[in-house]
């Protein structure tokens, strides 16, 4: 606890002090006082530098004195033999004695008192910037008129901070301008404009005179401008050294004027104004700016439109332009958006065709679609070549963005049929000779594939079974072979409206309009053993003449079995209808005269006993297309006959082309799975 005075005596004083002693005293007086330490008696073994015995006086880290020997007062009126005055409130006294004393030494007696210090004069560093006032136990600082004492209670300054300027135009000057500015001051001015305007400072050379820099180039007094993370200055000297106009690129500016204790000059005066924030005219490749201007400022809006074949990468799909606004921070909105080459993407795949993987899918790239030849061809033309257009679509010169359609090639067998004559009629055939041949297992019959979704057959084949099981692609209809062939599942059976349905079909004598269509659930995949037969054209070229040859095929009755396991076929000529009428109906169930013959029927056969028979019903009577000798069309469908091995009657398909097309069109919408 600090005291105002005190006494310090060596051990055993006034008796002789003992050997080998070390003792210390920590003196502390109250804050604001110094210490006056004085010795009234001193009798300590003398040695050089007081190496043996000594009393040491320490202030902080400084040794104020080291005493030994005997002392007596020089002043008869004062008992003081040695004294110390320190301007600090703490002092340490240390007494030491060594292991032996040749004589008897009595030590020392000392006293300390707290003394006032003059902080205003006693220290090298003046504690006050202006006026220093000492009092017992302390001091205080004071300021001249118009100055105020800072919070540190030592420094005086003028009240030049706190001004905030918000007007778009204004003038600011240093205190007392053009009279000398106050020393030891820090003046802070704030300019705060509306967002989107930058502060522009104008300072003429002659309006600036601030204490010059020292020899190291450091400003003693300085003017600094701070805008966000950007700083302009510090500036000092005679005449403004900075630019005439300072464009801060910010709506907020802090002005800091710092002065020291010496060298006051007239100071400075500046003007400022708010400029709408400029945005740079950026180079955005592959685009045009609307409107085009030399300079863009805050709130300006431009439309950036991509050149043809380029699009905006982000944002709306396929956008060709975007708007950008000059923002308050001097940056354009939507600056991340760029016009890049349109990417048409991976081209869509097509059924029964392919497209080579493109090297590039960007604007201008070219791709080619091809159909799976020779079983499919491109129906809608256009050559299959598409280029990546500016709108991001793959475009064909003829079809535009519409995809090519690969449809089955009709009427072209992979292998031509060659006859190998048998006893009554027909030869073994391969399904590749008749890839359109469809097998119905109940009743045992035939049909003709006319496209991916439709099978043409005779009405009498399906009238008793509206959900027939059909197979394609197999020469043999042995159960084990059928298991490996393609089974077709019907979705719906369409019997010609002119076909008369009977309660007892066995007694039928009228086979007029013996034609039906079966719509399949799933499309048939074409190949060497499965492909459709063409339909006849409607022109007179497709009118059959007597003697015209056609091919029939099927697994019906032959000269040696009730049904064939392997496909049979025969080539037979068209005959006059009377030839069929003249043949006696085998075991007629009705009067022979009751059998109906109409122009919707074709009579064919009669040569070498070649004929269709029970089990061939619904199969095609295939005739070479008069306009394309490589193709066959279904001129007829096996319908009925008076006797197997003579003449047979076939439904004349040409008379039903309109009904076929209409039925297929009206029922063409694919099922939704």
């Amino acid at each position: 606890e600090p005291t105002m005075y005190g006494e310090i005596l060596s051990p055993n004083y006034p008796q002789a002090y003992p050997s080998e002693v070390e003792k210390s005293w920590d003196i502390e007086v109250p804050e604001g006082y110094g210490i006056h330490l004085y010795f009234t008696h001193l009798d300590i073994e003398l040695s050089e530098n007081c190496a043996y015995d000594s009393v040491q006086i320490i202030s902080g880290d400084t040794e104020e004195g080291r005493l030994c020997g005997q002392r007596s007062s020089n002043n008869p009126h004062s008992p003081i033999v040695e004294e110390f005055q320190v301007p600090y409130n703490k002092l340490q006294v240390i007494f030491k004695s060594d292991f032996s004393n040749e004589e008897r030494f009595t030590g020392f007696a000392a006293y300390y008192v707290a003394t006032d210090i003059n902080e205003c004069t006693d220290f090298v560093d003046v504690p006050c910037s202006h006026f220093c006032n000492n009092f017992i136990g302390g001091y205080f600082c004071s300021c001249p008129p118009e100055y105020f004492l800072h919070d540190d209670m030592k420094n005086c300054g003028v009240n030049c901070s706190g001004d905030v300027f918000t007007a778009l135009i204004g003038e600011i000057a240093s205190p007392n301008y053009p009279k000398p500015y106050p020393e030891n001051s820090r003046c802070e001015y704030q300019i705060r404009l509306e967002k989107g305007f930058q502060v522009v400072v104008t300072l003429r050379r002659e309006d600036f005179d601030v204490e010059a820099a020292d020899s190291a180039g450091n400003c003693l007094d300085s003017l600094v401008f701070v805008a966000g993370d950007r700083q302009f200055g510090p500036y000092c000297g005679h005449g403004f050294p900075g630019p005439l106009n300072i464009e801060t690129k910010s709506n907020a500016l802090d002005i800091i004027f710092q002065t020291d204790l010496t060298g006051q000059k007239k100071g400075w005066k500046l003007r400022y104004h708010g400029d709408p924030m400029p945005c740079p005219k950026e180079d955005t490749p592959n685009s045009v700016w609307e409107p085009a201007k030399a300079k863009y400022v805050f709130r300006d809006v431009v439309q950036i439109t991509c050149l043809d074949g380029f699009e905006v990468v982000e944002g709306r799909v396929g956008a060709t332009s975007f708007y950008s606004t000059c923002q308050s921070n001097g940056k354009w909105s939507n600056s991340k958006l760029k016009c890049q080459p349109v990417d048409c993407g991976i081209p869509e795949s097509i059924e029964n065709g392919k497209v080579e993987d493109p090297e590039s899918t960007l604007f201008g790239s070219v791709i080619r679609y091809t159909c799976e030849e020779p079983y499919y061809y491109m129906e809608n033309g256009g050559g299959g070549e598409y280029h990546c257009a500016g709108n991001g679509s793959w475009v064909n010169e003829v079809l535009g963005p519409e995809l090519p359609k690969c449809v089955p090639v009709c009427g072209v067998p992979r292998e031509p049929f060659e006859e190998k004559q048998r006893i009554i009629g027909g030869s073994d055939a391969d399904i590749k000779n008749f890839p359109w041949q469809v097998f119905f297992d109940n009743p045992w019959a035939g049909g003709a594939l006319i496209n991916e979704y439709w099978v043409l057959t005779a009405a009498h084949v399906v009238e008793g079974n509206r959900e027939p099981t059909m197979y394609v692609g197999s020469t043999s209809v042995q159960t084990s072979r059928l298991a490996k062939s393609k089974m077709l599942t019907p979705e719906h059976v369409f019997i010609h409206p002119g076909w008369k349905l009977l309660e007892v079909p066995e007694g039928r004598t009228n086979f007029d309009n013996d034609i039906a269509l079966v719509r399949l659930k799933d499309p048939v995949k074409m190949g060497p053993t499965v492909s459709p037969i063409c339909l006849p054209g409607t022109s007179s070229d497709y009118n059959l003449m007597d003697g015209d040859l056609g091919l029939i095929s099927g697994w019906g009755r032959t000269e040696k079995r009730d049904r064939a396991v392997r496909l049979k076929a025969a080539r037979l000529p068209v005959a006059p209808l009377r030839k069929c009428k003249e043949v006696k109906v085998e075991k007629p169930t009705a009067d022979a005269e009751a059998y109906v013959f109409t122009p919707n029927m074709i009579c064919a056969g009669g040569e070498k006993g070649m004929d269709s028979c029970k089990g061939d019903s619904g199969g095609a009577f295939a005739v070479q297309d008069p306009n394309d000798k490589t193709k066959f069309y279904a001129a007829g469908l096996v319908s009925w006959g008076p006797q197997c091995g003579t003449y047979g009657l076939y439904t004349r398909v040409k008379n039903y082309v309109d009904w076929i097309m209409k039925t297929m069109q009206e029922n063409s919408t694919p099922r939704e799975d």
Epitope: R422, I423, I424, D441, N442, W444, T479, R557, E559, K560, R561, D562, R563, V565, K584, E586, K587, G609, K614, G615, Q643, C644, G645
Partner: antibody, heavy 121, light 105 residues
């Protein structure tokens, strides 16, 4: 009038062969298939095979492929069947039968009178 | 091969009685054919294409059926109908039934 005349009965030893003939008349021999059928008390009627007299095309029942050989002589309108490696199981009546197509398919329209083959040691 | 099963193996009927015998095929066939054989003679074609009567066959005979099930019917039994009747299929490799022996009571 159509007639199929078969050769007479045969008594043969096991392991030997026998040749049965079937002479036809009254129709076009080469126009129709000729069949051979075996009749035994145990197995009733069994089809052995068929031959197309026009081109000699033959189809056998798999069971008789190693047993029977069918041939024709077009000049005499005669069909033949040779049976080899005979055993007691081959003892039966053997028929030739012809198909005929006139106003429809007549399977086995005409039959021979049958030839009795007895295999005995 | 398609196996033909005839039933019954032996049956007898009184004169004027209706007679039905059946033949079942092991898998579906297109037609059934029937043959009549009297002792010591060759078989005769009797009914063909399931329901058609061969020439000279009395009208009291009829045939019917489809798929795997077929039958031969005599509407009114007569003494001359005593014989063995065989069914036969030619849809696949040719096979016969084991026969139904019909006797008069």
């Amino acid at each position: 009038q159509v007639k199929l005349q078969q050769s007479g009965p045969e008594l043969v030893k096991p392991g030997t062969s026998v040749r049965i003939s079937c002479k036809t008349s009254g129709y076009s021999f080469t126009g129709y298939y000729m069949h051979w059928v075996k009749q035994s008390p145990e197995k009733s009627l069994e089809w052995i095979g068929e031959i197309n007299p026009s081109i000699g095309d033959i189809t056998y029942n798999q069971r008789f492929k190693a047993k029977a050989t069918l041939t024709v002589d077009k000049s005499s309108s005669t069909a033949y069947m040779q049976l080899k490696s005979l055993t007691s199981e081959d003892s039966a009546v053997y028929y030739c039968a012809s198909d005929y197509y006139g106003g429809g398919f007549a399977w086995f329209a005409y039959w021979g009178q049958g030839t009795l083959v007895t295999v005995s040691a | 091969d398609i196996v033909m099963t005839q039933s019954p193996a032996i049956m007898s009927a009184s004169s004027g009685e209706k007679v039905t015998m059946t033949c079942s095929a092991s898998s579906s066939i297109n037609y059934m054919h029937w043959y009549q054989q009297k002792p010591g003679t060759s078989p005769k074609r009797w009914i063909y294409d399931t329901s058609k009567l061969a020439s000279g066959v009395p009208a009291r005979f009829s045939g019917s059926g489809s798929g795997t099930s077929y039958s031969l019917t005599i509407s009114s039994m007569e003494a001359e109908d005593t014989a063995t009747y065989y069914c036969h299929q030619r849809s696949d490799s040719l096979t016969f039934g084991s026969g139904t022996k019909l006797e008069i009571k």
